[in-house]
């Protein structure tokens, strides 16, 4: 028996966010903010341990 797809998204695709396209999702605080308030994290030296980087997920149109 053939099964339907388990998900419409690829396994590695970003999860949809609740933000309108004018904003970005801040994973650190788990809510939408102006995209300019997010900062792309700089690469850490090899071996350095740190919390998950602060990133933004842009919703798709």
């Amino acid at each position: 028996m053939r099964r339907g797809p388990r998900s419409l998204r690829g396994r590695d695709a970003p999860a949809p966010t609740p933000c309108v396209p004018a904003e970005c999702f801040d994973l650190l605080v788990a809510h939408c903010v102006a995209c300019g308030l997010l900062r792309t994290p700089r690469p850490k030296p090899a071996g350095a341990s740190s919390p998950a980087p602060r990133t933004a997920l842009q919703p798709q149109e």
Epitope: P18, C19, V20, P21, A22, C24, H31, C32, A34, C35, G36, L37, L38, T40, T55, A56, Q58, E61
Partner: antibody
Framework: EVKLVESGGGLVQPGGSLRLSCAIS????????MSWVRQPPGKALEWLGF??????????EYNPSVKGRFTISRDNSQSIFYLQMNTLRAEDSATYYC?????????WGQGTTVTVSA | DIVMSQSPSSLAVSVGEKVTMSCKSS????????????LAWYQQKPGQSPKLLIY???TRESGVPDRFTGSGSGTDFTLTISSVKAEDLAVYYC?????????FGGGTKLEIK
């Protein structure tokens, strides 16, 4: 069709309060951010703030120029969105617009005029 | 706050001419993670409310004629009208939504000769 209709403008004395309303139709109110923008006579536009959608807990952002005096709220059951303005000053005299926020300020109402004068 | 500066403040052109107007921001509006510039252009005709023309600096809003083109990145942006029509008489505003508070330029008033 998206339709936004502002009301509640008028003449108010300095120090007074006014509540503007924006009646919304043509889209699901709870699913959109809503913003207020004003324009003094013959001048440029000024963003006042917005209120996010249901998915974001109806959180707000304000322009520091009005934060503490102006409050944005919404009554989703009636598809109305409000701007409560307190301690009004002469420089608050303007046409006030509500706008739907999605990609930017996507749709605007026709505006309501507020005059602050003794 | 990000300061938005528009130039010229006004210009008069004949129908059919090409028009360009400039908008400069006091800091970059480019978000590197998605390569979007958080800049919009609005048209406000006399006695009317503003209308969104362009978002993300260069994406035309649905229903906007293709004679309107937005371009630029970072801090320098341009709105071009390829062949002006009489109905384009309006004030054009740029606005950043890169950070709070959202801010607008002072506008460029387009007059028809």
């Amino acid at each position: 069709e998206v339709k936004l209709v502002e009301s509640g403008g008028g003449l108010v004395q300095p120090g007074g309060s006014l509540r503007l309303s924006c009646a919304i139709s043509g889209f699901t109110v709870t699913a959109y951010y809503m913003s207020w923008v004003r324009q003094p006579p013959g001048k440029a536009l000024e963003w006042l703030g917005f209120i996010r959608d249901k998915a974001n807990g109806y959180t707000t952002e304000y322009n520091p120029s009005v934060k503490g005096r102006f409050t944005i709220s919404r009554d989703n059951s009636q598809s109305i969105f409000y701007l409560q303005m307190n301690t009004l000053r002469a420089e608050d005299s303007a046409t006030y617009y509500c706008a739907q926020v999605r990609r930017a300020l996507d749709y605007w109402g026709q505006g309501t005029t507020v005059t602050v004068s003794a | 706050d990000i300061v938005m500066s528009q130039s010229p403040s006004s210009l008069a052109v004949s129908v059919g001419e090409k028009v360009t107007m400039s908008c400069k921001s006091s800091q970059s509006l480019l978000y590197s993670s998605n390569q979007n510039n958080y800049l919009a252009w609005y048209q406000q005709k006399p006695g009317q409310s503003p209308k969104l023309l362009i978002y993300w600096a260069s994406t035309r809003e649905s229903g906007v004629p293709d004679r309107f083109t937005g371009s630029g990145s970072g801090t320098d942006f341009t709105l071009t009208i390829s062949s002006v029509k009489a109905e384009d008489l309006a004030v054009y505003y740029c606005q950043q939504y890169y950070t709070y508070p959202y801010t607008f330029g002072g506008g460029t008033k387009l007059e028809i000769k």
